[in-house]
Interface confidence: low
C-alpha cells in the first residue's frame, strides 16, 4: 500500500482550516489530516456527526 | 464541467487501446483527471490520473501498461492501455476530481470490448 | 491496497422505508471515505463525501456517518427513483479502492 501523506514543508502550515498539513506522495501538493470535529480535502466542513 | 469519452468501441487482444476525454467548460490545468473502469459484474477500478501540472498516478496493477496523457490546446486527456485482453472488457469512464481523490464530475462512459 | 467491503451485496424495500448501506475497509481511512450512486445505464454521482459531509443538490434523506473502518449510508424514506448500485470508495492510501457495491431494489 503507499501511504496518501508525507510531511508537509513549513511554507505550508496554514494551508489546513482545521487540520494538520500533508504532501500527497505522487504529487506536489499538500493534503489536510483533520482535527477531530472536521472533514475534507482542507479540513473546511464541520462535522456534525463528530 | 462536462466531460465525455470517445473510444474504438472493439479491440483484439494484444492491440492498444486509446480513449479521449474531451472537457468543456473548465481547464485540465487546474484540478486532477482521473480515469476509472466498471467491469461485467459492477466492479469498478480506479487506473490512475494526470493531475493540473501534467503529473501523473497510475495504479500499480496497471503499471506496466498504463499511459495518461493530455493536450491542453484541446483541453482532452486521454488513456493508452497497451497488450489489451478479455480481462480488459468493461465501461470506461473519465472523471474530474477537484482534490485528487473525490470524483466529482464524471462523463457517461465508453464501453470497450476485447474480442477475437 | 485497502479492499472495501460492501453489505449487503443486494437489498430490497419498499418506498417509505428507511435503509442502511454497510461499508467497511480493512485498514483505518480516517473519513476519507465517499458514496457514489450509479442507476441503471446511468453514470456514478457523489453522494456524501469524507464519510459525511453533504453535496450540493443531493436530497437531505441520504446520510453518512462512520470513522475508522466502518461507514454507513442511510437513506431516509426511500423512493422508488432511489434504486441503483451504491459504491463506496476510500480515499486515504493510494490507489483509491471501491467497494463491491450495493443493489437497492425498490420494490
Known amino acids: 500500500v503507499v501511504s496518501h501523506f508525507n510531511d508537509c514543508p513549513d511554507s505550508h502550515t496554514q494551508f489546513c482550516f482545521h487540520g494538520t498539513c500533508r504532501f500527497l506522495v505522487q504529487e506536489d501538493k499538500p493534503a489536510c489530516v483533520c482535527h477531530s470535529g472536521y472533514v475534507g480535502a482542507r479540513c473546511e466542513h464541520a462535522d456534525l456527526l463528530a | 464541467v462536462q466531460l465525455q469519452e470517445s473510444g474504438p468501441g472493439l479491440a483484439k487482444p494484444s492491440q492498444t487501446l486509446s480513449l479521449t476525454c474531451s472537457v468543456t467548460?473548465?481547464?485540465?490545468?487546474?484540478?486532477?483527471w482521473n480515469w476509472i473502469r466498471k467491469f461485467p459484474g459492477n466492479k469498478l477500478e480506479y487506473m490512475g490520473y494526470?493531475?493540473?501540472?501534467?503529473?501523473?498516478y497510475y495504479n500499480p496493477s496497471l503499471k506496466s501498461r498504463i499511459s495518461i496523457t493530455r493536450d491542453t490546446s484541446k483541453n482532452q486527456y486521454y488513456l493508452q492501455l497497451n497488450s489489451v485482453t478479455t480481462e480488459d472488457t468493461a465501461t470506461y469512464y473519465c472523471?474530474?476530481?477537484?482534490?485528487?481523490?473525490?470524483?466529482?464530475?464524471w462523463g457517461q462512459g465508453t464501453t470497450l470490448t476485447v474480442s477475437s | 491496497d485497502i479492499l472495501m467491503t460492501q453489505s449487503p451485496a443486494t437489498l430490497s424495500v419498499t418506498p417509505g422505508e428507511t435503509v442502511s448501506l454497510s461499508c467497511r475497509a480493512s485498514?483505518?481511512?480516517?473519513?476519507?471515505l465517499h458514496w457514489y450512486q450509479q442507476k441503471s445505464h446511468g453514470t456514478p454521482k457523489l453522494l456524501i463525501k469524507?464519510?459525511?459531509a453533504p453535496i450540493s443538490g443531493i436530497p437531505s434523506r441520504f446520510t453518512g456517518s462512520g470513522s475508522g473502518t466502518d461507514y454507513t449510508l442511510s437513506i431516509n424514506s426511500v423512493k422508488p427513483e432511489d434504486e441503483g448500485i451504491y459504491y463506496c470508495?476510500?480515499?486515504?492510501?493510494?490507489?483509491?479502492?471501491f467497494g463491491g457495491g450495493t443493489k437497492l431494489e425498490i420494490k
Open positions: 470508495l476510500q480515499g486515504y492510501s493510494m490507489p483509491w479502492t
Open positions: 467548460g473548465y481547464s485540465i490545468t487546474s484540478d486532477y
Open positions: 485498514q483505518n481511512t480516517y473519513k476519507n
Open positions: 494526470i493531475s493540473y501540472s501534467g503529473s501523473t
Open positions: 469524507y464519510a459525511s
Open positions: 472523471a474530474r476530481s477537484y482534490d485528487g481523490i473525490c470524483f466529482d464530475n
